[in-house]
């Protein structure tokens, strides 16, 4: 019961986590610029992995997608890749874990198969969570370093002058969503791995044969039959259950000091 609960909870936690990773990846608020007063009105800038937005105090909002793939910083591309890998792994993990759930019966799937699938999905969730946490952390590091905004400078560009305005970008809501979601996915994955240990069958899958001490003149033949030694009268090869070789499926064997395994 505890195993089923652990597995189910792990699945739900991972599901919430992956939904959060997807939400964070799609959100526009990865970096935000604090409200500043310009000659017109308060303008609020914020950016995501895919587009940049401006919102005015009047409520007007405009977003534009990043114009080129090649012109984007390598770090931004890396963050995108990490988040997408996290989503893909998480989605596959969810698919695998659905079939691995103990409460769901699919054909004659053995517990060992469910255990393996639970472990697989658990590992996928862990990697997915780590990808999301890494992606968000790399982006956060980009914001902290502020490498492009160290000084406000003016220079002459094509067709006029360009001035870089000193600005400070802060962590957007998406970063916190990503960190929390990544953490939840990671925790869910760990729970699935723990559940896997409980699902794995204690006994081995093959039929173990225990050899019990019997009469001094008894020879063993596979299949649990006593062979006649000339003294007995078992000429019809009747199966004998009182001390010969027995499979564990045939009889419950109670240990004694004479048992050899």
């Amino acid at each position: 019961m505890a195993v089923t609960a652990c597995q189910g909870l792990g699945f739900v936690v991972s599901l919430i986590g992956i939904a959060g990773i997807i939400a964070a990846t799609c959100m526009d608020q990865w970096s935000t610029q604090d409200l500043y007063n310009n000659p017109v009105t308060a303008v609020f800038n914020y950016q995501g992995l895919w587009r940049s937005c401006v919102r005015e105090s009047s409520g007007f909002t405009e977003c534009r997608g990043y114009f080129t793939l090649l012109g984007l910083p390598a770090m931004l591309q890396a963050v995108r890749a990490l988040m997408i890998v996290g989503i893909v792994l998480g989605a596959i993990g969810l698919l695998v874990s659905i079939f691995a759930l103990k409460c769901i019966r699919i054909g004659s799937m053995e517990d060992s198969a469910k255990a393996n699938m639970t472990l697989t999905s658990g590992i996928m969730f862990i990697v997915s969570g780590l990808c999301a946490i890494a992606g968000v952390s790399v982006f956060a590091n980009m914001l902290v370093t502020n490498f492009w905004m160290s000084t406000a400078n003016m220079y002459t560009g094509m067709g006029g002058m360009v001035q870089t305005v000193q600005t400070r970008y802060t962590f957007g809501a998406a970063l916190f969503v990503g960190w929390v979601a990544g953490g939840l996915t990671l925790i869910g994955g760990v729970m699935m791995c723990i559940a896997c240990r409980g699902l794995a069958p204690e006994e081995t899958n093959y039929k173990a044969v225990s050899y019990h001490a019997s009469g001094h003149s008894v020879a063993y033949k596979p299949g649990g039959f006593k062979a006649s030694t000339g003294f007995g009268s078992n000429t019809k090869n009747k199966k004998i259950y009182d001390g010969g070789a027995r499979t564990e499926d045939e009889v419950q064997s109670y240990p004694s000091k004479h048992d050899y395994v």
Epitope: S31, N45, S52, E62, W148, T164
Partner: nanobody
Framework: QVQLAESGGGLVQPGGSLRLSCAAS????????MGWYRQAPGKERELVAT???????NYQGDLKGRFIISGDNTKDTVYLQMNNLQPEDTAVYYC???????????????WGQGTQVTVSS
């Protein structure tokens, strides 16, 4: 790279009108606001008018009645309709865009090369 192309300047008699236009092209992301500045001979560059993408306008004190700023968001173009021009309006008029590139390059102010407006009889 962002380019600003201004047009519409010229010589006009006092009381006359002119319409300046400025189109931005290139890799433009979030435009915070666009507008016009002017610099008269021997003077500092001063704000004429600005407009946000949402249409909020701002004018330099006494210009509001005579000058009208407007923008076309689809074309990334800003216009300045100047009516009842006076000799003191003679200056080089510079188109202005403030564009936010965020993580791609911060906040940048762009000025055009300027277009000469001369008010003389």
């Amino acid at each position: 790279q962002v380019q600003l192309a201004e047009s519409g300047g010229g010589l006009v008699q006092p009381g006359g009108s002119l319409r300046l236009s400025c189109a931005a092209s290139g890799n433009i992301l979030s435009i915070n606001y666009m507008g016009w500045y002017r610099q008269a001979p021997g003077k500092e560059r001063e704000l004429v008018a600005t407009i946000t993408r949402g249409g909020t306008t701002n004018y330099q004190g006494d210009l509001k009645g005579r000058f009208i700023i407007s923008g076309d968001n689809t074309k990334d173009t800003v216009y300045l309709q100047m009516n009842n021009l006076q000799p003191e309006d003679t200056a080089v008029y510079y188109c202005y865009f403030r564009i936010n590139f965020g993580i791609l390059g911060g906040l940048r102010d762009y000025w055009g090369q300027g277009t000469q407006v001369t008010v003389s009889s």
